[in-house]
């Protein structure tokens, strides 16, 4: 099949980095500046991706491969091939339509991206809270009360109160 194709289609001989130029008797012409062809036998070269604005160039475009972008500091990539950049937040926050907002009481986020997640409910596993949760950290569950030796006690979680540093609404 390949041999037949070669006999019928001179373009199949054009390597990556070139295109089969119909205007020049189907000879193989190099891709023009700012374009590329990643496979052989192409009749056109593709325009290189430009990493503009918050996108930074991670890999320059070449005649045989597209440019690759990542995001400027303070942002992270989303989507296939870093098609979008999304703003980072601080730990203990999540990104909303209104910008970065602190996690609500009872939730945490230990990363600069993603959403605030509820603290682990230790009692569901029959365990007690060893270390209280914060906006940035999940609770640490300890042994179940029954596992504790006589006389020992676990740290009891504080009564749900308003979040530290936040005035009542």
């Amino acid at each position: 099949f390949e041999r037949t194709r070669s006999l019928q289609d001179p373009c199949s001989n054009c390597p990556a980095g070139t295109f089969c130029d119909n205007n020049r008797n189907q000879i193989c012409s190099p891709c023009p500046p700012n374009s590329f062809s990643s496979a052989g036998g192409q009749r056109t070269c593709d325009i290189c991706r430009q990493c503009k604005g918050v996108f930074r160039t991670r890999k320059e475009c070449s005649s045989t491969s597209n440019a690759e972008c990542d995001c400027t500091p303070g942002f992270h990539c989303l989507g296939a091939g870093c098609s979008m950049c999304e703003q980072d937040c601080k730990q203990g926050q999540e990104l909303t339509k209104k910008g970065c907002k602190d996690c609500c009481f009872g939730t945490f986020n230990d990363q600069k991206r993603g959403i605030c997640r509820p603290w682990t409910n230790c009692s569901l596993d029959g365990k007690s809270v060893l270390v209280n949760g914060t906006k940035e950290r999940d609770v640490v569950c300890g042994p179940s009360p029954a596992d504790l030796s006589p006389g020992a006690s676990s740290v009891t979680p504080p009564a749900p109160a308003r979040e530290p540093g936040h005035s009542p609404q």
């Epitope: 604005g53 918050v54 989303l78 989507g79 098609s83 979008m84 950049c85 999304e86 909303t96 339509k97």
Partner: nanobody, 123 residues
Framework: EVQLVESGGGLVQPGGSLRLSCAAS????????MIWYRQAPGEELEWVAN????????YYVDSVKGRFTISRDNAKNSLYLQMHSLRAEDTAVYYC????????????????WGQGTMVTVSS
């Protein structure tokens, strides 16, 4: 080609006003959230404001609330940022950006950015 082009920046005295514009082309403008960001010299990019597809939802960073107004004209494929009571700390390059598809639901990523327009607030 999908493109965003900002204009309207310049030198203004403290307390003054400016109106930035962002002209969109190459895509259906009315289908997308639009966002203003700014970058002060030596600082990271800072989100300023965003607006949903029909202009019914608008959000601002605390430091510009009551002074800046984001708006859009879908018939003209244009985004605006009206800035009043400007302060020295508003000095920055201002960028408009397009929210990626499904912005506000599954993510807050931007996929298209303009080249920026410089705003300098100085006496």
């Amino acid at each position: 080609e999908v493109q965003l082009v900002e204009s309207g920046g310049g030198l203004v005295q403290p307390g003054g006003s400016l109106r930035l514009s962002c002209a969109a082309s190459g895509f259906t403008f009315s289908n997308y959230w639009m966002i203003w960001y700014r970058q002060a010299p030596g600082e990271e990019l800072e989100w300023v404001a965003n607006i949903n597809q029909d202009g019914s939802e608008k959000y601002y960073v605390d430091s510009v609330k009551g002074r800046f107004t984001i708006s859009r004209d879908n018939a003209k494929n244009s985004l605006y940022l009206q800035m009043h009571s400007l302060r020295a700390e508003d000095t920055a390059v201002y960028y408009c950006a397009r929210g990626g598809e499904d912005y506000g639901n599954s993510h807050y990523g931007m996929d298209v950015w303009g080249q920026g327009t410089m705003v300098t607030v100085s006496s």
